[in-house]
C-alpha cells in the first residue's frame, strides 16, 4: 500500500483570497482504496472524491483555518494524515507616523500594519532599522491591536501598531529609518518595509 498527501507538509499557510488544492491518494495491493477528508475543527469547503484519491480545495477564507484529516483505508489497514491550514492576510499596507523625522530632538515614531491576520504577537514582529541594523537606543513601547472596520461581515482583520521613543538623531543625521514588519508562518517568512525620511 502507498498513502500520500500532496503537498506533504503537516502545516500549510494560505494567503487570504488564494486557493490551494490538497490531494490525498492511496493505492492498495488488492482492491480499491477508500480515501476521504474529514473536518476536525474546520468547515471542509469543496471536496472531490475519486476512487483512490480525494482532493480538498481550500478557498483562502478564514473559515478554512483548521486541521482537516485525510483517512485512507485498504482492507484491514487504515492511514491518517492531518494538515494544519493557516489562512493569513499580510498586505503591503504599512503606515508610518510622523511622515518624516526631525534630527536633533526626541520623538515618538509609530508604524501600523493594516488588514492583518493572524493578529498574533508570536507571528508578527516589528523592527525599526537604520540601514540593515536595528536602531540602537530606540525604546519600543507597548504594541497596540485594533480590529479593522470591515465592509463585509465575517472577516475580522486587525491593524497592529508599534511605537518607539527615539533618541535624538545625531549629526550628520541618517537619510532615513525604516519600519520593517515580519510575519512568520509555517515554512514561510514575509516582510514589508516602509521608509521614514529624515529632514536634512
Amino acid at each position: 500500500q502507498s498513502f500520500q498527501v500532496n503537498p506533504p507538509e503537516s502545516e500549510v499557510a494560505v494567503a487570504m483570497g488564494t486557493s490551494l488544492q490538497i490531494t490525498c491518494s492511496m493505492s492498495c495491493d488488492e482492491g480499491v482504496a477508500r480515501v476521504h477528508w474529514r473536518g476536525l475543527d474546520t468547515s471542509l469547503g469543496s471536496v472531490q472524491t475519486l476512487p483512490g484519491s480525494s482532493i480538498l480545495s481550500v478557498r483562502g477564507m478564514l473559515s478554512d483555518t483548521g486541521t482537516p484529516v485525510c483517512v485512507g483505508s485498504c482492507g484491514s489497514r487504515s492511514f491518517q494524515h492531518s494538515v494544519k491550514i493557516l489562512v493569513y492576510a499580510f498586505p503591503d499596507q504599512l503606515v508610518v507616523s510622523p511622515e518624516f523625522l526631525v534630527p536633533g530632538q526626541d520623538q515618538v515614531v509609530s508604524c501600523t500594519a493594516h488588514n492583518i491576520w493572524p493578529a498574533d504577537p508570536n507571528s508578527l514582529s516589528f523592527a525599526l532599522l537604520l540601514g540593515e541594523q536595528r536602531l540602537e537606543g530606540a525604546q519600543a513601547l507597548e504594541p497596540e491591536q485594533e480590529e479593522e472596520i470591515q465592509e463585509a461581515e465575517g472577516t475580522p482583520l486587525f491593524r497592529m501598531t508599534q511605537r518607539w521613543r527615539l533618541p535624538s538623531l545625531g549629526t550628520p543625521a541618517p537619510p532615513a529609518l525604516h519600519c520593517q514588519v515580519t510575519m512568520q508562518l509555517p515554512k514561510l517568512v514575509l516582510t514589508h518595509r516602509k521608509e521614514i525620511p529624515v529632514l536634512q
Epitope: F3, L40, F79, Q80, H81, S82
Partner: antibody
C-alpha cells in the same frame, strides 16, 4: 464530567468468551472514535481495536484479529468488545479510550480499566 | 506494521532536572506521534498530541518535538508528580503501536 466506565472483566478459562462494555458520559459519544487498549501485568500498553464514530470502520491488532469484535451502540453511549477463543496471553487490564476521528490526535479520555484473567 | 522504539527504557533523575525521552518510528509518520504518562495502578494520560501540541490541562514544562521518524518528549524541570512511566504512540496507521515505555525514577 467526561467519563468512561468499563465493566465485564473477570476470570475465564482458555477458549472461553467474555464481553466487555464501556459506558460513556459527559461528551458527544457519537462524534468520537473509540478504542480498546490493554496492558498485561508488568508490561507496556498494547492497542487492541478501534471503531469509527459511526461504527462503519473497525480495525484490529493482528494478535486479536478473528477472535475479538469491537462494536458500539450510539443510542446507549456504549462501546463493546466481544472476546472469543481467549488465551492466557489475553490476560490484561483492558481500557476503553476515545479519540477524535479514529486516532490521529491521541487518546484523550481513558476509563479506569477492567481486568481480564484467562487461566485454567 | 510501524515499530516504535523508545529510549531509554528507564532513567533516574532528581527534582528540577531536565529530562529528555526519545522515540523513533520505523517509517515516516509525519507528526502523528502522541505521548502519554502512566502512574502505577492508573490509566494513561495524554500529554502531547500531533508531536508537539500540549493537551489541555497539561503543565507547560512538558513539550514535544520532532517529525518524520524521530521524536522527543522533554520535561524542562522535573517535579515530584512527574515520576511515572512515559509512552509514545504512533497515530499514522493501524495497527496503532506504542513504544516500550520509559520509567522515570527518583535518583
Amino acid at each position: 464530567e467526561v467519563q468512561l466506565l468499563e465493566s465485564g472483566g473477570g476470570l475465564v478459562q482458555p477458549g472461553g468468551s467474555l464481553r466487555l462494555s464501556c459506558a460513556a458520559s459527559g461528551f458527544t459519544f457519537s462524534s468520537y472514535g473509540m478504542h480498546w487498549v490493554r496492558q498485561a501485568p508488568g508490561k507496556g500498553l498494547e492497542w487492541v481495536a478501534v471503531i469509527s464514530d459511526d461504527g462503519s470502520d473497525k480495525y484490529y491488532a493482528d494478535s486479536v484479529k478473528g477472535r475479538f469484535t469491537i462494536s458500539r451502540d450510539n443510542s446507549k453511549n456504549t462501546l463493546y468488545l466481544q472476546m472469543n477463543s481467549l488465551r492466557a496471553e489475553d490476560t490484561a487490564v483492558y481500557y476503553c479510550t476515545t479519540s477524535k476521528y479514529y486516532y490521529y490526535y491521541g487518546m484523550d479520555v481513558w476509563g479506569q480499566g477492567t481486568t481480564v484473567t484467562v487461566s485454567s | 506494521d510501524i515499530q516504535m522504539t523508545q529510549s531509554p527504557s528507564s532513567l533516574s533523575a532528581s527534582v528540577g532536572d531536565r529530562v529528555t525521552i526519545t522515540c523513533q518510528a520505523s517509517q515516516d509518520i509525519s507528526k502523528s506521534l502522541n505521548w502519554y504518562q502512566q502512574k502505577p495502578g492508573k490509566a494513561p494520560k495524554l500529554l502531547i498530541y500531533a508531536a508537539s501540541s500540549l493537551q489541555s490541562g497539561v503543565p507547560s514544562r512538558f513539550s514535544g518535538s520532532g517529525s518524520g521518524t524521530d521524536f522527543t518528549l522533554t520535561i524542562s524541570s522535573l517535579q515530584p508528580e512527574d515520576f511515572a512511566t512515559y509512552y509514545c504512540q504512533q497515530g499514522y496507521s493501524t495497527p496503532l503501536t506504542f513504544g516500550g515505555g520509559t520509567k522515570v525514577e527518583i535518583k
